[in-house]
């Protein structure tokens, strides 16, 4: 969480941002809130990015003003116009690109004063893994697949019964480049699995951590997946 204040003493307002991550090729949100003003026409929101000459986005007098917008953001940004009046300056970002990563500044002007806060935005790819029993294999085998990751993640297997066991000798992980030549499909195979046990396939890079669980018994198979972003720090 980053909390910024205006520089000019009593003419300062609090602006709060939250570091976040964008999934490339999908739509993202850069979070920013501020002390609200009662009059929409008095509120100016400017989003800037370090190293970028033009603005990322500008909202003033109750509408977008995009004449100074940098070309790389054209047609890709919006604020939640109906929520600006209650202090929400968060930015929607369409079709997140790797190059969108960096330091952003949310700069606010209201009748009460000015304020700003920075936000670190990471970009990459992350997806939910699915673990299945591989019936084509010669021995009892589990197959963990996740369609889109970047940068290349690590994959670790764990089991409920053999807690702390190292499965690297009985697993094999491969990374296959997807058609857009950036993200990769993750496939990890675990051999010699035993019945009546819960196995977890954990995929992690510096942006996200995802886990796929599978419980195999003689009568049924239960699956569960979970994904967590790692860098959501507020400012």
């Amino acid at each position: 969480l980053i909390i910024g204040f205006g520089i000019s003493g009593r003419h300062s307002i609090t602006v709060t941002t939250v570091a976040s991550a964008g999934n490339i090729g999908e739509d993202g949100i850069l979070s920013c809130t501020f002390e609200p003003d009662i009059k929409l026409s008095d509120i100016v929101i400017q989003w800037l990015k370090e190293g970028v000459l033009g603005l990322v986005h500008e909202f003033k007098e109750g509408k977008d003003e995009l004449s100074e917008q940098d070309e790389m953001f054209r047609g890709r940004t919006a604020v939640f116009a109906d929520q600006v009046i209650v202090g929400n300056a968060s930015l929607r970002l369409k079709n997140v690109q790797l190059t969108d990563a960096g330091t952003y500044k949310c700069y606010i002007i209201t009748s009460k004063g000015k304020g700003n806060a920075n936000l670190e935005y990471k970009t990459g790819a992350f997806s939910m893994p699915e673990v299945n029993v591989d019936y084509n294999a010669s021995s009892e085998t589990l197959r963990c697949e996740a369609p889109r990751w970047f940068p290349q993640p690590t994959v670790v297997w764990a089991s409920q019964v053999d807690q702390g066991a190292n499965f690297s000798e009985v697993s094999n992980t491969s990374f296959e480049l997807n058609s857009e030549n950036v993200t990769m499909k993750v496939v990890s195979v675990l051999y010699n699995v035993t019945i009546n046990n819960t196995y977890s396939c954990m995929i992690e890079n510096d942006i996200a951590k995802a886990t796929g669980d599978i419980k195999v018994t003689e009568s049924e198979i239960k699956r569960r997946s979970h994904l967590q972003l790692l860098n959501s720090k507020a400012s």
């Epitope: 999908e26 995009l66 004449s67 100074e68 369409k94 079709n95």
Partner: antibody
Framework: QVQLQESGPGLVKPSETLSLTCTVS????????WSWIRQPPGKGLEWIGY???????NNNPSLKSRVTISVDTSKNQFSLKLISVTAADTAVYYC?????????????WGQGTLVTVSS | EIVMTQSPATLSVSPGERATLSCRAS??????LAWYQQKPGQAPRLLIY???TRATGIPARFSGSGSGTEFTLTIRSLQSEDFAVYYC?????????FGGGTKLEIK
């Protein structure tokens, strides 16, 4: 109520330049993006390009560098120029307003003008 | 560029029934998709944007769904004025591209 009206010649000779103007009434040309879209007879829609009131533009690469879109805010107009036309450029040409900066659907359209490329 | 494919090319449905039109993108466009209706001799009319949000003045019988690569426009209880050509359009990436259209005709 915003209204758009295309104007320009209905017949252009091959290798010459197609020029069309879109006049916007019932609202300001400022603070919206504006586009040209075309539709060959009996076929689908093709996006040509856009312009913002500040002059920022972007064109469809399929038309290479044959397209120029310009704006005249004092007249509430924007224009299309397409050079070196061929019979394949025969189409109904529409001007349209982009719904907003994020949702690039087209909410207001002109009625369209048929431009035939023929000698 | 992102290629938009609509199916079927022609759909025959009786008035009062439901019509389901499909649109597929060659890669994910998230929810950045619009639907239009076009009648002969007229400009297209925006029905849906954001894959599922109805544009101003569009009747509730029109609904859009889907995200990623698969999208559907559903028209329930078809009225005589609904028979037209329908186009989908992605605005996830440049250039903006349209589907080839689905002609909805009276059965």
């Amino acid at each position: 109520q915003v209204q758009l009206q295309e104007s320009g010649p209905g017949l252009v000779k091959p290798s010459e330049t197609l020029s069309l103007t879109c006049t916007v009434s019932g609202g300001s040309i400022s603070s919206y993006y504006w586009s040209w879209i075309r539709q060959p007879p009996g076929k689908g829609l093709e996006w040509i390009g856009y312009i913002y009131y500040s002059g920022s533009t972007n064109n469809n690469p399929s038309l290479k560098s044959r397209v120029t879109i310009s704006v005249d805010t004092s007249k509430n107009q924007f224009s299309l120029k397409l050079i070196s036309v061929t019979a394949a450029d025969t189409a109904v040409y529409y001007c349209a307003r982009v719904y907003n900066n994020y949702d690039w659907g087209f909410d207001y359209w002109g009625q369209g003008t048929l431009v035939t490329v023929s000698s | 560029e992102i290629v938009m494919t609509q199916s079927p090319a022609t759909l025959s449905v009786s008035p009062g029934e439901r019509a389901t039109l499909s649109c597929r993108a060659s890669q994910s466009v998230s929810s950045n998709l619009a639907w239009y209706q076009q009648k002969p001799g007229q400009a297209p009319r925006l029905l849906i944007y954001g894959a599922s949000t109805r544009a101003t003045g569009i009747p509730a019988r029109f609904s859009g769904s889907g995200s990623g690569t698969e999208f559907t426009l559903t028209i329930r209880s078809l009225q005589s004025e609904d028979f037209a050509v329908y186009y989908c359009q992605q605005y996830h990436n440049w250039p903006l591209t349209f589907g080839g259209g689905t002609k909805l005709e009276i059965k």
